[in-house]
Interface confidence: low
């Protein structure tokens, strides 16, 4: 009540919408065929939709994406020295999030 | 450089610091015995360290946490009926982070 | 305004070392990454060295490896070189410039130089 | 390492002349490729960017083509400024290298 003050505060719901996550930059996303070589920078921020809903019938979603091409530093390794590199990777971020009904498969008898 | 601009803009390493993260509340921090019911709300926000450091020798990890007791509903279904209870949650924030050396064990020779 | 103004050039022996400074100023230096580039007395440009924005990443042209140290100082903003076993072929002017971003790798902004003279 | 070869290595133009100066990379660096003017006794100025972007405050009449091994920096009329001598420069990988140099001259 008001002028109470617990030493527990309620809970809140995490709604569903856009946070800053962290995305790796996984090598495969530059290069499949050569594990001879760095990234720089390993990770970076991204927008992903994260949250509960009202229910567990449905789910937080990404309802609008935009993809984000970003110059990264392919570091190869050449006759041990340094080498650097461009690449380009593009990212996901999520600009808009829903509630949606989950639609599970009913088994097949 | 200043005052360029390219499409690709160059990739920004994701820092090591506090991001809002969802936490679930899993059944299992409110009543490991019984299974008969729900929690209210399923997930909230709690402050984590995320984030890159310049090596992979370490790792962005809490320098310091804090607890933080919150207030959830037990719903139970007794006789068909949901009854209405609390109980307390302790969550866990990061208040702030560092890069920390990782230490891994020699193998025995 | 931009400005990158080095210092520290000067006559010195061979095997002699000098250390040159750059100090930054109109622009967030704790942001950019930084390089020195170097020419000959009537040649072309060098590329010596690179530091980026934290500090923590260096890289250098063949010919400074091993003898030449960059570094650099964000609470002051300052960029610096520390030159060792100094050679004859070392003798140029020395600019410091900005270079941007993790993948950017050109120079933007360049101080005025300053001459570094190896000879006996 | 990568090596840029500029031709011509001195040219002679008048006023309001086009002018194209040529960059030719000893392989295929993408559009990573940059152009510097420099004037005697003073530092290099940027010019052009990622091979076409001019670079702020940079005059229109400058513009910069080309992709993989040969790019072209153009002065579409030459004024009294542009007298000077003009660099390319890789950004594709380390070490980064620089052409040896043009020099435009007064006729």
């Known amino acids: 009540s008001l002028g109470s003050l617990a030493a527990a505060e309620p809970a809140v719901i995490a709604e569903c919408k856009t946070r800053t996550e962290v995305f790796q930059i996984s090598r495969n996303l530059i290069d499949r065929t050569n594990a001879n070589f760095l990234v720089w920078p390993p990770c970076v921020e991204v927008q992903r939709c994260s949250g509960c809903c009202n229910n567990r019938n449905v789910q937080c979603r990404a309802s609008q994406v935009q993809m984000r091409p970003v110059q990264v530093r392919k570091i190869e390794i050449v006759r041990k020295k340094p080498v650097f590199k461009k690449a380009t990777v593009t990212l996901e971020d999520h600009l808009a999030c829903k509630c949606e009904t989950v639609v599970t498969p009913r088994p097949v008898t | 450089s200043l005052g360029s601009l390219a499409a690709a803009e160059p990739a920004v390493i994701a820092e090591c610091k506090t991001r809002t993260e969802v936490f679930q509340i899993s059944r299992n921090l409110i009543d490991r015995t019984n299974a008969n019911f729900l929690v209210w709300p399923p997930c909230v926000e709690v402050q984590r360290c995320s984030g890159c450091c310049n090596n992979r020798n370490v790792q962005c990890r809490a320098s310091q946490v804090q607890m933080r007791p919150v207030q959830v509903r037990k719903i139970e279904i007794v006789r068909k009926k949901p009854v209405f209870k609390k109980a307390t949650v302790t969550l866990e924030d990061h208040l702030a982070c560092k890069c920390e050396t990782v230490v891994t064990p020699r193998p025995v020779t | 305004e931009v400005q990158l103004v080095e210092s520290g050039g000067g006559l010195v022996q061979p095997g002699g070392s000098l250390r040159l400074s750059c100090a930054a100023s109109g622009f967030t230096f704790s942001s950019y990454w930084m390089s020195w580039v170097r020419q000959a007395p009537e040649k072309g440009l060098e590329w010596v060295s690179t530091?980026?924005?934290?500090?923590?990443?260096?890289y250098y042209a063949d010919s400074v490896k091993g003898r030449f140290t960059i570094s650099r100082d964000n609470a002051k903003n300052s960029l610096y070189l520390q030159m060792n076993s100094l050679r004859a072929e070392d003798t140029a002017v020395y600019y410091c410039?900005?270079?941007?971003?993790?993948?950017?790798?050109?120079?933007?902004?360049w101080g005025q130089g300053t001459l570094v003279t190896v000879s006996s | 390492d990568i090596q840029m070869t500029q031709s011509p290595s001195s040219l002679s133009a008048s006023v309001g002349d086009r002018v194209a100066i040529t960059c030719r990379a000893s392989?295929?660096?993408?559009?990573?490729l940059n152009w510097y003017q420099q004037k005697p006794g003073k530092a290099p100025k940027l010019l052009i960017y990622a091979a076409s972007s001019l670079q702020s405050g940079v005059p229109s009449r400058f513009s910069g083509s080309g992709s993989g091994t040969d790019f072209t920096l153009t002065i579409s009329s030459l004024q009294p400024e542009d007298f000077a001598t003009y660099y390319c420069?890789?950004?594709?990988?380390?070490?980064?290298?620089f052409g040896g140099g043009t020099k435009v001259e007064i006729k």
């Open positions: 392989q295929s660096i993408s559009n990573y």
């Open positions: 530091i980026s924005d934290g500090g923590g990443l260096t």
């Open positions: 420069q890789q950004s594709y990988s380390t070490p980064l290298t």
């Open positions: 410039a900005e270079s941007g971003g993790y993948t950017d790798w050109l120079f933007g902004y």
